[in-house]
Interface confidence: medium
């Protein structure tokens, strides 16, 4: 309902005749619509790396031994089932929570085919009421299952080896003309059974299998290395309409919570009642002169507050996202109303402390003003909770709307999707996926690091055993100190007989310095869990320091960061071990072993078992790790 | 760079208005809040208000409540506050600072001070 | 509204020293606590928002910690620079309040 705010025609009643009931518009507009919808977009990139790092060109290796690619769209049956009802032939109730996932049952129905995601560039996968007793339900005398699975294999399978492009996967609720707040709450049912992305890249081994259209873990006997990936929200939580913001004039059932609840019977005081603005009038609610209140008092609905002394009573938005600097709480309140109350705005970020919001008022017309507070762009997910506390014997409070508005900018925001990956061991142990090909073996039977390991581009997992992996020295004169790769030979380092990248600081006699460079690495994916890790050890007396440097080609330019440094060591001779974390890493970029050295100094560096985790380029976090420096 | 000028030292009689300036550069000056704060021996800084230059909503502290008129020129980008019936109490330095909406908690640059001085 | 209680109020300390100041609300505010350096002459500078995060161009000397009701400020290797009068202001609740301020000066 508006008051002197250009909200738009609502349905209310008209100035005679008998009062119409309000009606949702049957059918949602198209950006309505989409905001209904769960979109998965797996970014290009991704496809990439995935390719450049597991899939060799088909040509290298025989069709047996070839990856092989799954996918499949998952989600929990039991808030959809809530949403049919009791339906026949359920053998555990749509109330009770579904079975465990480890053991849960799925039926899987059939995703889309390669030829319509090649034509529209996206898969629209569309959940009616049909699809969900299908999936979930299944013929009459069959058990319930707790998974609804929608098979992705070919197209995913199809994306990965000759896609371009990011993959894009939108599940929305069917459209059909049926009753008001259908889609809605369709909408919210398939976000609460928290949709997720299933991908599955697995080395084959002895034999081919036909690719079952579940996805459990392939046996032994035919896989070598199985890599598991999730794509879901980070915050299922959030509603749908935080995609293009929330305008609330109680005219028709809102995605608000109030405290203490909502009362639509007349009889109960002290608590939030939704009344008509026609009521309102023969109550006398409202003050101005009574001709002027039937003409001017807002049409539709608004919220009536009658509180008893010293009380507080809360409006809780639903979770929201903000993209955009301009977010704003807008409420209408009536101001003649609650002499002795105030109105305190709160923002309730997630996993954050409440913090109160500056309402700046606006006199609206007729006794009505706008109170209006900037929220502009948290970093997280977020509810605005609006909270009215009375201060004397009694008061009235009125709200006309609550809209939360301009907090999309550009594109929508939505909600962030994380993508986890995982390895999966031969005995069935899932490790994150930086455990694989670390130089430490997580599996019982080491397989990860094995094969695939062996397999990564050249640098990507260095042991020096074949030489020296892309590192690479400037031309040097015979008499330059240079960098080797060898075996520690020396009764003490019995434990370590392999290869190393070693330099030998002995007998100069003035100041020298030595670099070694790797080979180029790829920009990471943005906002992924990217590290580095090397073993290194410096042996007797270093008069000097031992630098890592990452330089990122940016735009042509280089630009050299250090990440790691030890300076005049005394050392123990024990292999040390690291993980740096490569933060903010945006171009592609190699790494620079550079030690300088004076005289006297008598050490040997050395450097092993270096690798760069695989979630650099194969996962993606939901939010982003660098913190913006915002104050 | 990023700049608040603030106007210079003024010297009123008891009882007349004022209207400090404060202009800023080197950034969207409707994408910030704009607040006052006053700095006295006795009572250290207090916070008087904020204007939102992009709507022209204001808030106050209802210490000042009558006190200061806040006021924005989105065009010469410049944030004004008028203190009136002034008093010898009036009589500190005032600083504007800006407010990132969200980074709402704190003040991340501020004006140099404008001094004034109630004196008959 | 919220009282920030400020200790010491001034102090002395050597080039080099590490020096804490500290800062109660009168009510948990949840981290909302900022730190905020004032120059002789007149100049104020936000150093720490939000508890403990640094605001750009602000020397990794300052550090900022603390939850609830109890917060500090600590400058770990003193510089002639700091000579300055150092102010918290909890921006939890509204209106914004601040601490009474600790005026540091080099012995």
């Known amino acids: 309902v508006g008051s002197g705010m250009g909200t738009g025609q609502r349905a209310g009643s008209p100035a005679a005749g008998p009062p119409l009931q309000p009606r949702e518009p049957l059918s949602y507009s198209r950006l309505q619509r989409k905001s209904l919808a769960v979109d998965f977009v797996v970014p290009s990139l991704f496809r990439v790396y995935a390719r450049d790092l597991l899939l060799p060109p088909s040509s290298s290796e025989l069709k047996a031994g070839r990856p092989e690619a799954r996918g499949s769209l998952a989600l929990d049956c039991a808030p959809l089932l809530r949403l049919l009802g009791p339906a026949p032939g359920v053998s555990w109730t749509a109330g009770s929570p579904a079975p465990a996932e480890a053991r849960t049952l799925s039926r899987v129905l059939k995703g889309g085919s390669v030829r319509k995601l090649r034509r529209a560039k996206q898969l629209v996968l569309e959940l009616g009421e049909e699809a969900i007793l299908e999936g979930c339900v299944g013929p009459p005398g069959e058990a319930a299952v707790g998974l609804l699975q929608f098979n992705l294999s070919e197209l995913f399978s199809w994306w990965i080896r000759q896609g371009e492009g990011r993959l894009r996967i939108r599940l929305m609720p069917e459209k059909k003309a049926s009753e008001v707040g259908r889609e809605g709450r369709l909408s919210a049912a398939i976000r609460a059974s928290q949709p997720r992305l299933l991908f599955q890249i697995f080395g084959t081994g002895h034999s081919s299998l036909e690719s079952p259209t579940n996805m459990p873990s392939p046996s032994p006997d035919y896989f070598t290395w199985n890599l598991t990936w999730i794509m879901k929200d980070s915050f299922p939580f959030l509603s749908h309409r935080s995609r293009y913001g929330l305008e609330c004039s109680f005219d028709f059932p809102c995605e608000l919570e109030y405290s203490p609840p909502l009362h639509d019977l007349r009889n109960q005081s002290w608590s939030w009642r939704r009344i008509p603005s026609e009521e309102a009038s023969q109550m006398d609610l409202l003050d101005g002169p009574g001709a002027e209140r039937s003409k001017e008092m807002p049409r539709g609905s608004f919220l009536l507050l009658n509180t008893s002394a010293d009380s507080k009573h809360t409006i809780l938005s639903p979770w929201m996202r903000s993209s955009s600097e301009h977010c704003t709480l807008a409420v209408s309140v009536h101001r003649h109303l609650q002499p002795s109350g105030r109105y305190i705005a709160q923002l309730l970020p997630h996993n954050e402390a409440a913090r109160e919001i500056l309402l700046m008022p606006t006199p609206g017309k007729h006794g009505w003003t706008v109170l209006q507070g900037r929220i502009g762009r948290p970093d997280n997910p977020f509810r605005v909770a609006l909270e009215y506390i009375s201060s004397g014997n009694r008061s009235l409070s009125a709200v006309d709307f609550f809209a939360l508005k301009n907090c999309s900018e550009g594109t929508s925001p939505g909600s962030k999707m994380a993508l986890q990956s995982s390895f999966t061991c031969w005995n069935g142990t899932v490790l994150q996926l930086g455990q694989a090909c670390d130089f430490h073996q997580d599996c019982a039977q080491g397989e990860d690091e094995s094969q695939m390991c062996r397999k990564l581009p050249v640098g990507f997992y260095c042991n020096f055993e074949d030489g020296f992996c892309g590192w690479t020295q400037g031309t040097l004169s015979p008499h330059t100190p240079q960098w080797q790769v060898r075996t520690l030979k020396d009764a003490r380092f019995q434990d370590h007989q392999d290869h190393a990248l070693l330099l030998s600081t002995t007998d100069v006699p003035a100041s020298e310095s030595a670099t070694v460079t790797s080979a180029t690495f790829p920009a990471p994916i943005k906002s992924s869990p990217c590290e580095l890790r090397m073993s290194w050890l410096i042996r007797g007396v270093l008069r000097g320091n031992v630098s890592l440097v990452l330089v990122e080609n940016k735009t042509g330019k280089e630009q050299g960061r250090m990440v790691w440094h030890v300076a005049a060591y005394e050392g123990l001779s024990l292999w040390q071990w690291m993980v740096l974390p490569l933060l903010d890493v945006s171009d592609r970029f190699w790494l620079q072993m550079v030690a300088w050295w004076g005289q006297g100094s008598r050490a040997i560096v050395a450097f092993d078992n270096i690798s760069i985790s695989l979630d650099c380029y194969l996962t993606i976090s939901g939010e982003d790790k660098i913190l913006q420096n915002t104050a | 760079a990023l700049q608040l000028q603030q106007s210079g030292a003024e010297l009123v009689r008891p009882g007349a208005s004022v209207t400090l300036s404060c202009k800023a550069s080197g950034y969207t000056f409707t994408d910030y809040e704009m607040h006052w704060v006053k700095q006295t021996p006795v009572h250290g800084l207090e916070w008087i208000g904020a204007i939102d230059p992009e709507t022209g909503g204001t808030a106050y502290n209802q210490k000042f409540e009558g006190k200061a008129i806040l006021t924005a020129d989105k065009s010469s980008s410049t944030a004004y506050m008028e203190l009136r019936s002034l008093t010898s109490e009036d009589s500190p330095v005032y600083y504007c600072a800006r407010r990132r909406y969200y980074g709402s908690s704190s003040f991340d640059y501020w004006g140099q001070g404008t001094t004034l001085t109630v004196s008959s | 509204d919220v009282q920030m209680i400020q200790t010491p109020s001034s102090l002395s300390a050597s080039l080099g020293d590490r020096v804490t100041i500290s800062c109660r609300a009168s009510q948990d505010i949840g981290n909302y606590l900022n730190w905020y350096q004032q120059k002789p002459d007149g100049t104020v500078k936000l150093l720490i928002y939000?508890?403990?995060r640094l605001h750009s161009g602000v020397p990794s000397r300052f550090s900022g910690s603390g939850s609830g009701t109890e917060y500090s400020l600590t400058i770990s290797n003193l510089e002639q620079e700091d000579i300055a009068t150092y102010f918290c202001?909890?921006?939890?609740?509204?209106?914004?309040?601040f601490g009474g301020g600790t005026k540091l000066e080099i012995n």
């Open positions: 939000y508890t403990s």
């Open positions: 202001q909890q921006g939890s609740a509204l209106p914004p309040t």
